[in-house]
C-alpha cells in the first residue's frame, strides 16, 4: 500500500538498516526510496528537546511485514518509501537549505556570485554531490561568497549542522541539468585500471553500467563477462572512480568490458530498469519466497508486485509436473544485486520492474504534412499529438509532442490568432483525423507558455509549452518522448523522422492519416549556405535531402523531429520553418530542443 504522507512526532521502532543525514524529512523519504532495502524511515528534525547531534538523522529501516511499531517522539518524522507507490519517482532536489552546513569532503573551494552559481558549478562537476555556500552576510570576511563543492561515499552528508549565513543544496545532475558529457559507449576488451569503490555481481555490462549510474561514487566501471578466465571474477562489476573523473589507464583484456556512469544522461535512458531476462542463469541471494508460476514473465510480475523482492530465478516445470507451472524464487540482498551468478543450471533470471518507475517513462521501448512521406501505423509515434482550435470552427492547427504527463511541447508560431487556451484541444493516441468526433476525449489546455524571446520563427525561439488541464495516463498509444540530454550535444543522430498531418505539397490540405518521413540531419554550416538571407543559429537544427522530395510542410508545425539513439527515441527538433516544402537544397529548419532543455525544465518544474 502506498502511503505518501509523513507522520509527525512519530518514530518507527526497530528495523534499522543504516543512518544517513538529510536536510529534510522529504529528502529522507527519497533516500529511503532509492535504497535497495529501505521501506520505512524515521527522520529527526531540529528541536530544542533533541540532542543536536541527532538533528537531521535519517534512519533507514526494513521490515518483513512492511511496517513497524510506532512510538511517539517529539521532533521525529516518519514515513514510508515510495517503493510501494506506482507513481513516477525522481531524485531531483532543487531545494536550497538556509543556515545549514552539509558536511562532506570539501574538495573544491572557489568564489561564486550566488548560491545558484554554486549549485550550477556542483551540477557540472563530476565528483560533486552537494555544496555549501557562504553568503555575503557570512561573518568571516575571507569566507564570504565561497562555494564549497563536496562529496561523500554515500552521496549524502556525513553530518548536518546549523550555521548562520550559509546555504546548502544538492547537485542537480538527477534533474537532467548537467552539462557533463553523456558517454553511452561500452568498450569491449577493455579494463579500466583505477581504484574500485565497490563491486557487485551483474549478468551483463549494461546492468553493470546502470548500477554504476545510480551508485553515488561511481564514475566508470569494468565488467568481467562469464567467459572471463578467472572463475571467481566472472560476472563481477567493478565500480570505479579517479581524481580526474576519467580512467587513468585502459588495459586491453579479452572478455572484459568497460564504460562510464550515465548520470549525465539518466533522464533519457533507463538506468534503474533492468528489464531483460537471463536464460540459463541463476541469481543467488536471500530467499524471500518460492511460488508456482506459469512462465518467467509471470515470475517477474510476482517479483515486481512483492515490494521486498529485488530479483528472481525461475525454474521451468519438468514435463507435466505441477500443472505445467515452474518454481519462482523471489530473492533479495543487501545491495539489490545477486550475491552470486551461476550459469548452466537451466534457470531464467531477472530483476524486479518496480524500479522502472524511477526511470523516465519516455525510455520505455515502443512498438516498433510530410512530403514524400508514408502513412504511420497506430502506436508508432505515441508522443505525437494533434492540436486543434475550436474557433471559428474546429480544425487541426499544429502537431505537438507529449514530454510529461501534463505537458506538450510545440512551436510558438502555432498560436497566431489564439486569443485564449480555452479554444484549444489536444488529442493524443490519434492515427486518423477522422477518428475525432464530437464525443472524442481530449485534453483541455490550462496554459500556453511561449518563449519570451520568440518574435518570428525565422529568428528562433520558436518553442512553446502547453500545460494540460488533466494528466495523461500513459498507454501504448500515448506516452512521452525523451528530451535530448545536454550531455548529448555531440551525438550524431542518424535515424531521424518527421511526423505530422500536414500538407503533402505546398498547395494541399491536412492529411487524414499521420504521415512519417525519414530525413537526414544537415549540419548548421551546410544549412546556413542554403539560407544566406537568414541567420541559422545553434538554437536551430536542419534536416532534409539535398535533392528535396521529403520534408515537413504546412500543418506539421510544432510536431516532432524524433531521432532514435541507443534504442531510445529523443525529441531532437520541433518543426518550425523552411522555404517552401521539400524544395531542392532547402532543408527544413527545426527548433533545436537540446538548447532549450533548461528552459523546458524551468517551466515544467516550476512550483
Amino acid at each position: 500500500e502506498c502511503v505518501t504522507q509523513l507522520l509527525k512526532d512519530t518514530c518507527f521502532e526497530g528495523g534499522d538498516i543504516t543512518t544517513v543525514f538529510t536536510p529534510s524529512a522529504k529528502y529522507c523519504q527519497v533516500v529511503c526510496t532509492y535504497h535497495p532495502r529501505c521501506l520505512l524511515f524515521t527522520f529527526t528534525a531540529e528541536s530544542p528537546s533533541e540532542d543536536p547531534t541527532r538533528w537531521f538523522t535519517c534512519v533507514l529501516k526494513d521490515s518483513v511485514t512492511e511496517t513497524l511499531p510506532r512510538v511517539n517522539r517529539t521532533a521525529a518524522i516518519s514515513g514510508y518509501s515510495f517503493k510501494q507507490c506506482s507513481h513516477q519517482i525522481s531524485a531531483c532536489n532543487k531545494d536550497i537549505y538556509v543556515d545549514l552546513d552539509m558536511k562532506g569532503i570539501n574538495y573544491n573551494s572557489s568564489v561564486a556570485k550566488s548560491a545558484q552559481e554554486c549549485q550550477e558549478r556542483c551540477t557540472d562537476d563530476v565528483h560533486c554531490h552537494f555544496f555549501t555556500y557562504a553568503t555575503r552576510q557570512f561573518p568571516s570576511l575571507e569566507h564570504r561568497n565561497i562555494c564549497l563543492l563536496k562529496h561523500t561515499q554515500t552521496g549524502t552528508p556525513t553530518r548536518i549542522t546549523k550555521l548562520d549565513k550559509v546555504v546548502s543544496g544538492f547537485s542537480l545532475k538527477s534533474c537532467a541539468l548537467s552539462n557533463l558529457a553523456c558517454i553511452r559507449d561500452i568498450f569491449p576488451n577493455t579494463v579500466f585500471a583505477d581504484s574500485n569503490i565497490d563491486s557487485v555481481m551483474a549478468p551483463d555490462a549494461f546492468v553493470c553500467g546502470r548500477i554504476c549510474t545510480h551508485h553515488p561514487g561511481c564514475l566508470f566501471f569494468t565488467f568481467f563477462s562469464q567467459e572471463w578466465p578467472k572463475e571467481s571474477q566472472r560476472n563481477l562489476c567493478l565500480l570505479k572512480t579517479s581524481e580526474s573523473g576519467l580512467p587513468s589507464t585502459r588495459i586491453k583484456k579479452s572478455k572484459a568490458l568497460s564504460g562510464f556512469s550515465l548520470q549525465s544522461c539518466r533522464h533519457s535512458i533507463p538506468v534503474f530498469c533492468h528489464s531483460s531476462f537471463y536464460h540459463d542463469t541463476d541469481f543467488l541471494g536471500e530467499e524471500l519466497d518460492i511460488v508456482a508460476a506459469k512462465s518467467h514473465e509471470a515470475c517477474q510480475k510476482l517479483c515486481t508486485n512483492a515490494v521486498r523482492c529485488q530479483f528472481f530465478t525461475y525454474t521451468p516445470a519438468q514435463a507435466s509436473c505441477n500443472e505445467g507451472k515452474g518454481k519462482c524464487y523471489l530473492k533479495l540482498s543487501s545491495n539489490g544485486s545477486p550475491t552470486k551468478i551461476l550459469h548452466g543450471r537451466g534457470g531464467i533470471s531477472g530483476y524486479t520492474l518496480r524500479l522502472c518507475k524511477m526511470d523516465n517513462e519516455c525510455t520505455t521501448k515502443i512498438k516498433p504534412r510530410i512530403v514524400g512521406g508514408t502513412a504511420s501505423v497506430r502506436g508508432e509515434w505515441p508522443w505525437q499529438v494533434t492540436l486543434h482550435t475550436t474557433s471559428p470552427t474546429q480544425r487541426h492547427l499544429c502537431g505537438g509532442s507529449i514530454i510529461g504527463n501534463q505537458w506538450i511541447l510545440t512551436a510558438a508560431h502555432c498560436f497566431y490568432g489564439v486569443e485564449s487556451p480555452k479554444i484549444l484541444r489536444v488529442y493524443s493516441g490519434i492515427l486518423n483525423q477522422s477518428e475525432i468526433k464530437e464525443d472524442t476525449s481530449f485534453f483541455g489546455v490550462q496554459e500556453i507558455i511561449i518563449h519570451d524571446q520568440y518574435k518570428m520563427a525565422e529568428s528562433g525561439y520558436d518553442i512553446a509549452l502547453l500545460k494540460l488541464e488533466t494528466t495523461v495516463n500513459y498507454t501504448d498509444s500515448q506516452r512521452p518522448i525523451c528530451l535530448p540530454s545536454k550531455g548529448d550535444r555531440n551525438v550524431i543522430y542518424t535515424d531521424c523522422w518527421v511526423t505530422g498531418w500536414g500538407y503533402r505539397k505546398l498547395r494541399d490540405k491536412i492529411q487524414n492519416t499521420l504521415q512519417k518521413a525519414k530525413i537526414p540531419l544537415v549540419t548548421n554550416e551546410e544549412c546556413q549556405k542554403r539560407y544566406r538571407g537568414h541567420k541559422i543559429t545553434h538554437k536551430m537544427i536542419c534536416a532534409g535531402y539535398r535533392e528535396g522530395g521529403k520534408d515537413a510542410c504546412k500543418g506539421d508545425s510544432g510536431g516532432p523531429l524524433s531521432c532514435k539513439h541507443n534504442e531510445v527515441w529523443h525529441l531532437v527538433g520541433i518543426t518550425s520553418w523552411g522555404e517552401g516544402c521539400a524544395q531542392r537544397e532547402r532543408p527544413g529548419v527545426y527548433t533545436n530542443v537540446v538548447e532549450y532543455v533548461d528552459w523546458i525544465l524551468e517551466k515544467t518544474q516550476a512550483v
Epitope: 486569443e419 500556453i448 518570428m456 523552411g578
Partner: antibody, heavy 118, light 112 residues
Framework: QVQLKESGPGLVQPSQTLSLTCTVS????????LHWIRQPPGKGLEWMGL???????SYNSRLKSRLSITRDTSKSQVFLKMSGLQTEDTATYYC????????????WGQGTLVTVSS | DVVLTQTPGSLSVTLGDPASMSCRSS???????????LEWYLQKSGQSPQLLIY???NRFSGVPDRFAGSGSGTDFTLKISRVEPEDLGVYYC?????????FGSGTKLEIN
C-alpha cells in the same frame, strides 16, 4: 479586465518632441507585445512600432530615426517619444495589444489626439 | 517595406447586397513557418479599429459568418455576403509577415 489608455499633450509645437504614455491594466507587459499606431484626421492607419514583451523594439522604417519606444514594467507603462514634429504628425495615436503572439490586435486604447501647431 | 494596396478606395453598396474588396501586397505574405500574417480590421466612425479576420481567412470569434477572407501570396480579398448597417466604416488590411508591419490604405464602405 484588459484596458489600455493613451495620455500625453494635446498640443505640441513644431520641431518639438512628442511624449506619449500608454498605461495598461489587466495584463503584464512582460507577457504581451504592445504596438503604437497613428491615424491623421480623415486618413488611414499607420503602424509606428512595437515593444516586444522581452524588451526589444521594432520601428516603422520611415519613422525610425525620430522614434523611440521604452517601457516601465513596474508601472505597466509604455512610452513613445518622437522628435522633430511637423504638422503632418498631427494624428490620433493609439496603443494596441496583440493576442498570444504580436498580432492580431485584440485590444486598443481609445486613442489620444495630438495636434502639431504653433 | 511591404506596401499594401487596397482597392477600391471606397465602395457604395445597397443594404443586403454583397460587397468585395481587395488587398494586394508588394511581396508574398506567406511566412516560412506556414502562416500568412494577413489581417482585416474594420474602423467604424469615431471608434478604434476592431479585428475581423486573421491569417487570411480565419474569422475572429464573434464576427458574423457573412464576412469571409480569402487569397494567398500577394492577393487577398474580403467579401461580405449581405451588407448590414453595422458593417459601414473603413476596412484596413494589415500584414505582420515582414518587419516592419504595414497597413493598407483602407476601403470605405458606404450605403448607396
Amino acid at each position: 479586465q484588459v484596458q489600455l489608455k493613451e495620455s500625453g499633450p494635446g498640443l505640441v509645437q513644431p520641431s518639438q518632441t512628442l511624449s506619449l504614455t500608454c498605461t495598461v491594466s489587466g495584463f503584464s507587459l512582460t507577457s504581451y507585445h504592445l504596438h503604437w499606431i497613428r491615424q491623421p484626421p480623415g486618413k488611414g492607419l499607420e503602424w509606428m512600432g512595437l515593444m516586444w514583451r522581452d524588451g526589444d523594439t521594432s520601428y516603422n522604417s520611415r519613422l525610425k530615426s525620430r522614434l523611440s519606444i521604452t517601457r516601465d514594467t513596474s508601472k505597466s507603462q509604455v512610452f513613445l517619444k518622437m522628435s522633430g514634429l511637423q504638422t503632418e504628425d498631427t494624428a490620433t495615436y493609439y496603443c494596441a495589444r496583440g493576442m498570444t503572439l504580436a498580432t492580431p490586435f485584440l485590444y486598443w486604447g481609445q486613442g489620444t489626439l495630438v495636434t502639431v501647431s504653433s | 517595406d511591404v506596401v499594401l494596396t487596397q482597392t477600391p478606395g471606397s465602395l457604395s453598396v445597397t443594404l443586403g447586397d454583397p460587397a468585395s474588396m481587395s488587398c494586394r501586397s508588394s511581396q508574398s505574405l506567406e511566412s516560412s513557418d506556414g502562416n500568412t500574417y494577413l489581417e482585416w480590421y474594420l474602423q467604424k466612425s469615431g471608434q478604434s479599429p476592431q479585428l475581423l479576420i486573421y491569417g487570411v481567412s480565419n474569422r475572429f470569434s464573434g464576427v458574423p459568418d457573412r464576412f469571409a477572407g480569402s487569397g494567398s501570396g500577394t492577393d487577398f480579398t474580403l467579401k461580405i455576403s449581405r451588407v448590414e448597417p453595422e458593417d459601414l466604416g473603413v476596412y484596413y488590411c494589415f500584414q505582420a509577415t515582414r518587419d516592419p508591419f504595414t497597413f493598407g490604405s483602407g476601403t470605405k464602405l458606404e450605403i448607396n
